[in-house]
Structures are given as structure tokens and as C-alpha cells.
Interface confidence: low
């Protein structure tokens, strides 16, 4: 079926094109042969010029980008919102865990509080930073907490007779803490629980942030010139023939889109795997793999560990008295 | 004490926290997210079709444009397209993904590998070593009350404390701890933890 004769004056085409590119005189007054056209190859006279074709290509690619962004809007919002919500929730868990631990010290060991608050604060700060991706070693964090606590426990509770100026003994006490396993297996227990739960939490947040990155990447893809030409032919070449109201055929659109999005569609396999792997991770996030569970119970384990020290207090004081005697003498002088 | 509200009382490992229980827990929120994400599992494979359905396409019209001419919607020519002498659609597909897409695929592969290695195999939630060290050695339910790492006599049960994003009515930040909050009569050198 031959195309219907174009508008003898290209008037319709001009008024449409004006909306795309106001003020430009690129539309021929009357149909022209269009021998310079590269995309909308005419079968007869045409109302398009080379400049118009270029503008159509630009518009087509912009349209495509906007369609892609509107397609991903809901998914993008879902992940961005949840990433923010979980990050905030984890911060709240950390804050409450710190509060519970501080309250435990205040109510059970008031003599330790000023320093304990600081050590607990530093520990939970590191927990927060670890979740957000800092290069901090969980075992070091736990060791630092117990290394810092023991000198205070020793000087305030087990050997309160030491003068306040005795600070040199601290280094010796920190070393003794590990050598003598003064807290029993509690530090090891806490290390295992905290590292497992925090690792899972960290990877969960990393995965959500990568999800956002994936969508941002595909959202802002720059489509190739070839794709721009295909889109132009599909959406705009009909205008050159004065066919303003006609729409592309459905099957044709699918073929063009698959051509334009061949690269993007390659993500599909990995995207599916991403969602299923994330589901698997989430299903396992309970008990010692749930940071909420682990951190909110830390105060109790720390309490137990201090009780353990108290229980063995007599034996420890004697051993440490010998072990750290040199430090103490130096202080008393 | 001005620093700790009366409704938080910890003694002999009993934790009583008076606050409104919010039904939505973190784990339920995680599961809800996964369910919503699963509805987007075919997002990328469905994208070409989605875009066609959201851009002007002939649905009820008898005639449609196939890139070269006006044709009947159900004719052979409608599915074919006027590209024969232009450039090859197959070639366009063969070019492979853009570098940015390849990069993001690599990142996805990496995170998928990490997620798989981090996932807890069913029925293996507790490591043997942990069990031996006394973790969860008590009669604790799976969902409601979670036992929290403690050993010895006084096993503590904490009702899943943080109902999702439920800010408690108090805030016991270290910053608010005694010797750290500034009151009118407090000297600067009493603040011992301002940079902790």
C-alpha cells in the first residue's frame, strides 16, 4: 500500500517539530526529495531534512532514557528506602545495645562507670563503623574492650588499695588479661557471635547499596547511535510522510527494544541470582546471625564475664601481684 | 539519677524495658523487602516489553508503522521492519554490553558469591564450637524469645527488644552519661569522653 500523499505544505510537520525545537527553520516549506537523509529513507518526497533527523535521533534517545528511568522508579525507590531504613535501624540497635551495656555497668558496677562508658562507647562506635564498611577487625575490637576493662576492674574492684596515680600497671594488666584468660572464654564467645552477626549485617547493607548502583547504572545508560537510529525510525520517521497520528506496530517495537537493550538484558541472569541469594542470606539472619539479637544481649555476656573475674578474684590478685609487681613498685616510689 | 530513667532497670541479668511493642520487627521488615524484591525478579528480561507497553504502540488501530511504511496491524509486514538496507539488528546485539554494564555485572557476580558464602545452610545456624561454649544452652523458642549468648546459671531471655525502628522513650547515649553531660555547674575537665 503506497503511503498517502504528504501534506503539500509540510505544515503539520512544521507545527509538530516547532514543539521539539522552537524557532528553528529546519522544516522544508514543501516536501523535498530527501536524498541526504540517512535514517528516514524516503520512498517519495519527504518533509524531513538532515538536521531534523539529527534532532529526532537526539529526542528518541532522550525518550528512551526517560522511559527506562520511569520503568525502574518503583524498584529504585524500594531499595533506596530500605537501604536507608535498615542502616538507620542498625544504628538504633547499636545505640540501644550501648545503652543496655552502660545501664548494666551503672546498676551493677558503679565504680567502673566513668571509664566503662568510654570503652563501651568506643567499642560500639567501631561496631557502627564496621557495619558501614570500615576496615576494622572484630577480634581487635573485642580484645580492645576487654583489654581496657580489665585494668579498671582490677584497680577499682579487685585491688582498690592501689593509689589513683598507679597508671603504669595498666600495660601489665592489659597483657595479663590475655595471658591469664581472666575473662574465661567469654571474649572468644563474644568475638564469634559479634563477628558472625556483623558480617552478615554488613554484607546485607552492601548488597542493598549495590542494588541501587545496578539500577543507577542502567538508569543512566547512554544508548548507541545505532539504537538512536532504530528508535528514530520507529517513533519519528512516519512524521516525515505526514503520518502524525500513526503508532509503531507492537511486534516491531519489541524487536527494536530488544536490539537497543541487548546489553542491559544480559544483567538479567545475575539480577535474578542477586535477589535469590539475598533471600537466602535473609532467611539465615537469626539467632547468632542476627545482630539485633546478639548486640542487645551483649550486656548480659559482659556481665557474666565480670562475674567470672570476680569469682576467681583471689587467685587472680595473687598471680597478678607477682606478675605486675615491678610496675607497682615503680609507681609506689 | 538524672541520666537513667526509672523504666530501665537492670539487675541480676533481668532486663525490663517499658516501652510500646511495635509489631514490625527488623526480621519481618527484611522478609517483606525480599518479597517485594522478588516481584522484580524478571525486571531486566521484561524491560523491552515494559517500555513498548509504556510508549505509543498501536493497540486498537487497524494500521501501524513498521519503520518504513503504514501496514495492517496483523500482517506479516507488521512484525518485519524496514531495516533491511539500514543496519543489521543482529550486529547490534552482537556488540555486547557497554563497559559500564560489564562492570556492574562483575560487581553483581562478586556480591552474589559473597552472599552465597555468607548464607547460613539450613539447620546449621549454630556452629558446633559455639554450642560447646555454652551459647543457647537452654530451652529457648525460635521466634518469640531469643536466647542471647550467655552461659552458666542465669540465662537471659530478651523479648526481641528492638521493635522495628521503635525509638525508646529514653536515650542513654554515652554522651548523656554522668560526667559527660554539661550542666551549668559542670567544669570542662569533668567531661571525660567527648571524643570517644
Amino acid at each position: 500500500q503506497p503511503p498517502p500523499p504528504p501534506d503539500a505544505t509540510c505544515h503539520q510537520v512544521r507545527s509538530f517539530f516547532q514543539r521539539l525545537q522552537p524557532g528553528l527553520k529546519w522544516v522544508p516549506e514543501t516536501p523535498v526529495p530527501g536524498s541526504d537523509l540517512q535514517v528516514c529513507l524516503p520512498k517519495g518526497p519527504t518533509c524531513c531534512s538532515r538536521k531534523m533527523e539529527e534532532k529526532y535521533q537526539l529526542t528518541a534517545r532522550l525518550n528512551m532514557e526517560q522511559l527506562l528511568q520511569s520503568a525502574s522508579m518503583e524498584l529504585k525507590f524500594l531499595i533506596i528506602q530500605n537501604a536507608a531504613v535498615f542502616q538507620e535501624a542498625f544504628e538504633i540497635v547499636v545505640r540501644h545495645a550501648k545503652n543496655y551495656t552502660n545501664a548494666m555497668f551503672k546498676n551493677n558496677y558503679p565504680s567502673l562507670t566513668p571509664q566503662a562508658f568510654e570503652f563501651v562507647g568506643e567499642f560500639f562506635t567501631d561496631v557502627s563503623l564496621y557495619i558501614l564498611g570500615s576496615d576494622i577487625n572484630v577480634d581487635d575490637m573485642v580484645n580492645e574492650l576487654f583489654d581496657s576493662l580489665f585494668p579498671v576492674i582490677y584497680t577499682q574492684m579487685m585491688n582498690p588499695g592501689l593509689p589513683e596515680s598507679v597508671l603504669d600497671i595498666n600495660e601489665c594488666l592489659r597483657g595479663a588479661r590475655r595471658d591469664l584468660k581472666v575473662f574465661g572464654s567469654f571474649p572468644k564467645l563474644i568475638m564469634t557471635q559479634v563477628s558472625k552477626s556483623l558480617q552478615v549485617t554488613r554484607i546485607f547493607l552492601q548488597a542493598l547499596n549495590l542494588g541501587i548502583e545496578v539500577i543507577n547504572t542502567t538508569d543512566h545508560l547512554k544508548f548507541s547511535k545505532d539504537c538512536g537510529r532504530m528508535l528514530t525510525r520507529m517513533w519519528y520517521c512516519s512524521y516525515c510522510q505526514g503520518l502524525m497520528m500513526v503508532k509503531p506496530c507492537g511486534g516491531y517495537c519489541n524487536v527494536v527494544m530488544q536490539g537497543c537493550m541487548a546489553g542491559v538484558v544480559e544483567i538479567d541472569k545475575y539480577w535474578r541470582e542477586y535477589i535469590l541469594s539475598l533471600e537466602e542470606l535473609v532467611n539465615g539472619m537469626y539467632r547468632i546471625y542476627d545482630m539485633e539479637n546478639v548486640l542487645l544481649g551483649l550486656f548480659s555476656t559482659i556481665h557474666d564475664s565480670i562475674q567470672y573475674v570476680q569469682k576467681n578474684g583471689g587467685k587472680l590478685t595473687t598471680t597478678i601481684g607477682k606478675l605486675c609487681a615491678h610496675s607497682q613498685q615503680r609507681q609506689y616510689r | 539519677s538524672a541520666y537513667y530513667p526509672e523504666d530501665l532497670f537492670i539487675d541480676k541479668k533481668i532486663l525490663k524495658v517499658a516501652h510500646v511493642e511495635h509489631e514490625e520487627t527488623l526480621s519481618s521488615r527484611r522478609r517483606e523487602l525480599i518479597q517485594k524484591l522478588k516481584s522484580f525478579i524478571n525486571f531486566y528480561s521484561a524491560l523491552p516489553g515494559y517500555i513498548c507497553s509504556h510508549s505509543p504502540v498501536a493497540e486498537n488501530d487497524t494500521l501501524c508503522w513498521n519503520g518504513q511504511e503504514l501496514v495492517e496491524r496483523y500482517s506479516q509486514k507488521a512484525a518485519r521492519n524496514g531495516m533491511k538496507n539500514q543496519f543489521n539488528l543482529h550486529e547490534l546485539k552482537m556488540k555486547g554490553p557497554e563497559p559500564v554494564v560489564s562492570q556492574i555485572i562483575d560487581k553483581l557476580k562478586h556480591i552474589n558469591q559473597l552472599l552465597r558464602t555468607m548464607s547460613v545452610p539450613k539447620g546449621k545456624v549454630l556452629d558446633k564450637s559455639l554450642d560447646e561454649e555454652g551459647l543457647e544452652s537452654g530451652d529457648c523458642g525460635d521466634d518469640e524469645d531469643e536466647c542471647i549468648g550467655s552461659s552458666g546459671d542465669g540465662m537471659v531471655k530478651v523479648k526481641n527488644q528492638l521493635r522495628f525502628l521503635a525509638e525508646l522513650a529514653y536515650d542513654l547515649d554515652v554522651d548523656d552519661a554522668p560526667g559527660n553531660k554539661q550542666h551549668g555547674n559542670q567544669k570542662d575537665n569533668e567531661i571525660t569522653t567527648s571524643h570517644s
Partner: antibody, heavy 120, light 112 residues
Framework: EVQLVESGGDLVKPGGSLKLSCAAS????????MSWVRQTPEKRLEWVAY????????YYPQTVKGRFTISRDNAKNTLYLQMSSLKSEDTAMYYC?????????????WGQGASVTVSS | DVVLTQSPLSQPVSLGDQASISCTSS???????????LHWYLQKPGQSPKLLIY???NRFSGVPDRFSGSGSGTDFTLKISRVEAEDLGVYFC?????????FGGGTKLEIK
């Protein structure tokens, strides 16, 4: 890349007010404590304000207490210093600095500074 | 407030030589948790200060190993084993064991 960019520095009369801003990028702003430090024309450094990551605990030295207010908007990744009742001795270059908490008070990143001149 | 006194005020040095800057505190900087919060910063001309060393002897990331910190209690030293042109500027010590945190008066490292 961690970046801190101060703005709002100006020439102001004694007794006047000024608000400095510090826009942070390249790190998780909401998890770090922050400080303002000033450098006098004689090149002496003086800490003027500190705020915890959540924003609920500001501290000041006696020299500025009651006149300066530090605040932060974690949603906007921005730190502020509201200065009022300014004196000529407040003339300085004002830097915002990130406290790397793991390093207790070591200020690991500083902005380029905002110049404040108090003069009649 | 804790007073930090740096010496010398100015340190003329030849490129490739070793330089040593001293920082003395009016009271001990050993914290009750066993850590000493004494830090060193370098301010190059026209720039803001940059962290070099934290907690007496720990080099901040990206700081060359020719910089080293030592000391305890009230006396601290920053050493630069082989001075390079890019090391010129003013060095400040700072403490955060006690509140408020304070800074030394600075030592200017310049070419002989």
C-alpha cells in the same frame, strides 16, 4: 574521596553574628563526630566546638561557650557553627574537621577553611 | 587546660637530613584506658592541617614511613628520617586525652 568544604566566612562587626557551614562528602557523615577548629592570625590552632555523630552532645571551650552553637544535619551531610556576640579575638580561619572516632580525637580530615574577620 | 610546648620554634634543615621536633605536655597524656592520645599534624603553606601521626606513633594512611613518632607521659618526639622538599611546613602536636583538646604552638621546618 573524603571532602569537607566550609562556607559562610565574612567580615563582621563586633557583637555581630555569622553562621558557617561545612558540606561533607565521600564518607558516612552520620557516623562520625565532628569539630570546628580555628587558626588565629598568629597561626595558633584552637579547638572551638565538638559534636557527637548523632548531634545530641555539643561541647565548647570556655572561650566560646554561650556564644557559639555547633549543630549538624545528617540528612544533608552538613555541619554548622552559629557564632554570635562576636569579638575581635574570634578573627581566625575556621576549619571543620572529622574526628576519626577509632583514633579518639585525631582529626583525620580537615576542610580548606572559612575566613572570619571581626572588625569595626 | 593542658599546655603543649613545642621546640624548637623553627627548625632549619638540609634536604636528606634527619629532623626532630619535640612536644612537652604540662601533664601526663596517658589515659586511664592505657592509651596516649597525642597526635601530630603538618600544615603546608596555604593549606589546612593534615593528620600525620595519631596516638603517639601510629602513621595515618598515606603518610610515608620516614615519619615516626615516639614518647610517653609528657615528652614526645616527631622524627623525619630524610627530609624532602614536600615535608616543609608547620608541624603541630595535639592532645585529646584531656578536655578540651589542645594544640602546640607549632614548629616551622624550613630549608637551611
Amino acid at each position: 574521596e573524603v571532602q569537607l568544604v566550609e562556607s559562610g566566612g565574612d567580615l563582621v562587626k563586633p557583637g555581630g553574628s555569622l553562621k558557617l557551614s561545612c558540606a561533607a562528602s565521600g564518607f558516612a557523615f552520620g557516623t562520625y563526630d565532628m569539630s570546628w577548629v580555628r587558626q588565629t592570625p598568629e597561626k595558633r590552632l584552637e579547638w572551638v566546638a565538638y559534636i557527637s555523630s548523632g548531634g545530641n552532645s555539643p561541647y565548647y571551650p570556655q572561650t566560646v561557650k554561650g556564644r557559639f552553637t555547633i549543630s549538624r544535619d545528617n540528612a544533608k551531610n552538613t555541619l554548622y557553627l552559629q557564632m554570635s556576640s562576636l569579638k575581635s579575638e574570634d578573627t581566625a580561619m575556621y576549619y571543620c574537621a572529622r574526628q576519626n572516632i577509632a583514633r579518639r580525637g585525631a582529626m583525620d580530615f580537615w576542610g580548606q577553611g572559612a575566613s572570619v574577620t571581626v572588625s569595626s | 587546660d593542658v599546655v603543649l610546648t613545642q621546640s624548637p620554634l623553627s627548625q632549619p634543615v638540609s634536604l636528606g637530613d634527619q629532623a626532630s621536633i619535640s612536644c612537652t605536655s604540662s601533664q601526663s597524656l596517658l589515659h586511664s584506658n592505657g592509651n596516649t592520645y597525642l597526635h601530630w599534624y603538618l600544615q603546608k603553606p596555604g593549606q589546612s592541617p593534615k593528620l600525620l601521626i595519631y596516638k603517639v606513633s601510629n602513621r595515618f594512611s598515606g603518610v610515608p614511613d620516614r615519619f615516626s613518632g615516639s614518647g610517653s607521659g609528657t615528652d614526645f618526639t616527631l622524627k623525619i628520617s630524610r627530609v624532602e622538599a614536600e615535608d616543609l611546613g608547620v608541624y603541630f602536636c595535639s592532645q585529646s586525652t584531656h578536655v578540651p583538646p589542645t594544640f602546640g604552638g607549632g614548629t616551622k621546618l624550613e630549608i637551611k
